[in-house]
Each structure stands twice: as C-alpha cells, then as structure tokens.
C-alpha cells in the first residue's frame, strides 16, 4: 500500500481551523492478524530524508496522537489530552485519515507528517509516510480562509517504506 497526500500545502489565516489529510492507497489486508497504526508529527523542513525526525505537534508526541485499528476501520482520538490542545486525529472507512487543528497561530506553521504502520502479528511491519506544509499567515496578506494546493501526482503518492 501507499500513502497519498492530496494537498502538499495549506495556507491558513490565524484563528482558523484546518484539517490535514492523508489517504491510504492500494490493497489493504483486512485479515484479523493485521492492524494499522496511524499517527501525525512535525518534522524539519531542511532534512535530507523528509519526516525522519519526529517532533511534537503542540507539545503532543506521535504516541499521543496515534490511532490503532484494523483495515479500513473508522477511528478517532477521543482522549481529553489532544482535545485540550485543539487537536483531533481521525480515520474513516475509505482509507482517509486526518488531523484537525483548531484556532491556528503563526507557531503552528511547519512541515507535518502522517505515518502509517501496517503491523502483521508475528511477522514484519510495513511503514509509509506523507508530508505536507502548513503556513499560517497573519496581517493583510493572510487569506480569509484556508487555501489548499494539490500535490503533484508524483508527490501525492510519495512513499517511504522502512
């Protein structure tokens, strides 16, 4: 399977909410011995290997924000910790998974990574990620609502397997 990032850049005004999205593509094993670990984190723009560094989002680590479920099942973070930080991660039946960030400020600007780990019990892991940029703008240059820029077809199916 692959991870697609439908949008490579989100440009939002301060105070707005944004939902960053990734999508699982390709055949997904729905066997009872397969589970999916999905999460989000920030990373450094300057890295040679994108998304190799895992930094917190609003002080919450990728462990705090993870979803753990089988196949194309729906799930979302319901714990108070994430919601107190204005964050919610979710996953639907169609392979889409997302993180919603509320009341954006300039300090939320950065590179965001989604990570999917397919865990086969007693066997190996398959790990892929996607990356997207969030730019939060202030002042007269800022848009009135979030503007999203589609990934190129090559970028949108950018996969990194470990």
């Amino acid at each position: 399977f692959k991870v697609a990032t439908p949008y490579s850049l989100y440009v939002c005004p301060e105070g707005q909410n944004v939902t960053l999205t990734c999508r699982l593509l390709g055949p997904v094993d729905k066997g009872h011995d397969v589970t999916f670990y999905k999460t989000w984190y920030r990373s450094s723009r300057g890295e040679v290997q994108t998304c190799s560094e895992r930094r917190p989002i609003r002080n919450l680590t990728f462990q705090d924000l993870h979803l753990h479920h089988g196949g194309h099942q729906a799930a979302n973070t319901s714990h108070d910790l994430a919601q107190r930080h204005g964050l919610e991660s979710a996953s639907d039946h169609h392979g889409n998974f997302s993180i919603t960030m509320r009341n954006l400020t300039l300090l939320d600007s950065g590179l965001y990574c989604c990570l999917v780990v397919e865990i086969r019990h007693h066997h190996s892991e398959h790990r892929v990620h996607g990356a997207m940029e969030l730019q939060v703008q202030t002042g007269k240059d800022a848009p009135s609502n979030c503007v999203v820029y589609p990934s190129s077809s090559q970028d949108s199916e950018n996969i990194t397997a470990a």
């Epitope: 920030r42 450094s44 723009r45 300057g46 930094r55 400020t105 300090l107 730019q135 002042g139």
Partner: antibody
Framework: QVQLQESGPGLVKPSETLSLTCTVS????????VHWIRQPPGKGLEWIGV???????DYNAAFISRVTISVDTSKNQFSLKLSSVTAADTAVYYC?????????????WGQGTTVTVSS | DIVMTQTPLSLSVTPGQPASISCRAS??????????MQWYLQKPGQPPQLLIY???NVKSGVPDRFSGSGSGTDFTLKISRVEAEDVGVYYC?????????FGQGTKLEIK
C-alpha cells in the same frame, strides 16, 4: 555552513529610502524565515520584520507604513527597504535566520551593517 | 506588544562566581507547554549569539555553565561560574507573538 551578510550604503539622507540586502548561503530560502533587526548606537535590539519561507511578511507596527521586506530567490538575497528615514533610523542593521520548525529562535545572524542618516 | 523587562541592567561579577539575570514578560509566552523564550549574548563589536532557546535548552556548542529556567512570564539565565569571555550584553527575547520583542539588555562586566 549557514551564512548571512548584510550590505548597503553606509550613509542615507533624511527623507530618502534606506535599501539593504542580505545575501545568504548554506540553507534553502524556502526552509526558514529571515528577519531584520536593528540596534541604534549604544541601545538595545529592535525587531523590524520578517519574510517567511512562503514569501509572506510580518512587520513591527512601528515600521509598517514605511517598511518592505522581499526576497529574490535567484540571487539568494533578501532586501529591506525603509522609506522616509530620519536620524532616529541610524543604527546597525542585522539580518538573522530563524529556525522555526519547532522552536522559534534566531540561530544565525549576519555581522550587521552600519547605516547613518545624515544630510 | 509583549514587553520584556530584564533585571538587573548591569552586573559586575568576580571570575569563578555565579551570575543570574531575570526576564519578565508582560504576558505569558507559553504555547501548549513550550516557552518561546530565548537568551542571547552580544559580545563587544559582534552580532548577538544564541545561548538558550525555548527557555531551558542550551544551544549546541554553548558551555554548560549556562542554563535557563522559567515558564509563563518569569525566566532566569544563570551562569554557574563566570569567565572573562562571558562579558557582553545579555538579551532575552520572546517568539510567542508578533512583533518579536527583546529585553533592554543586561551588561555583564568582570570585576
């Protein structure tokens, strides 16, 4: 190695426009914000404004009516323009790179360029 | 604007002795648990150099005699044993809100 170097005329006449350039090397212009900060003689540091990696800008309200910060990616240069200058704009002007992937701080500064406003 | 107030504005310290500088912000510089507060040292004739970021993280290459602490509005820079090379002006700076603002500076001299 990350480097920033300011350049521009050392002397500007009152009411004219001060134009400075910050030439950078060792990092991608699309990966960091570049700020302009000034220091009047014998005084503290004053933040003027920033151009972020996406090209948008934020300015100190004290300068907003007369300041423009821009980037020329083909030349790896950032520029500061400050119009209608007075003697109070005499200062050392610095450009500084900001590491804002997570912790927001000025990690590398230029050496500064001295600008005197006088007729 | 967030106003940064440093105390003292100057201090004279004997080599080997400790030194402490305080910085108070007019409002909190916290963002979801991270204090967006930095400390810089400006040596004579040089641009400022980063010592501490996010209140307590010592920049790589900075001697471990420097440390930072605090959260919310009150922050402290400590030098455990002052050395001759530590002379200069120390500035605190916040990155919580535009405009980024600096303290007035604290001049450290050696006795």
């Amino acid at each position: 190695q990350v480097q920033l170097q300011e350049s521009g005329p050392g002397l500007v006449k009152p009411s004219e426009t001060l134009s400075l350039t910050c030439t950078v090397s060792g990092f991608s212009l699309t990966s960091s914000g570049v700020h302009w900060i000034r220091q009047p003689p014998g005084k503290g540091l004053e933040w003027i404004g920033v151009i972020w990696s996406g090209g948008n800008t934020d300015y100190n309200a004290a300068f907003i009516s007369r300041v423009t910060i821009s980037v020329d990616t083909s030349k790896n240069q950032f520029s500061l323009k400050l119009s209608s200058v007075t003697a109070a704009d005499t200062a050392v002007y610095y450009c500084a790179r900001e590491d804002y992937d997570y912790d927001w701080y000025f990690d590398v500064w230029g050496q500064g360029t001295t600008v005197t406003v006088s007729s | 604007d967030i106003v940064m107030t440093q105390t003292p504005l100057s201090l004279s310290v004997t080599p080997g002795q400790p030194a402490s500088i305080s910085c108070r912000a007019s409002e909190s510089v916290e963002y979801y648990g991270t204090s967006l507060m930095q400390w810089y040292l400006q040596k004579p004739g040089q641009p400022p150099q980063l010592l501490i970021y996010a209140a307590s993280n010592v920049k790589s290459g900075v001697p471990d005699r420097f440390s930072g602490s605090g959260s919310g509005t009150d922050f402290t820079l400590k030098i455990s044993r002052v050395e001759a090379e530590d002379v200069g002006v120390y500035y605190c700076q916040q990155s919580r809100k535009v405009p980024w603002t600096f303290g007035q500076g604290t001049k450290l001299e050696i006795k």
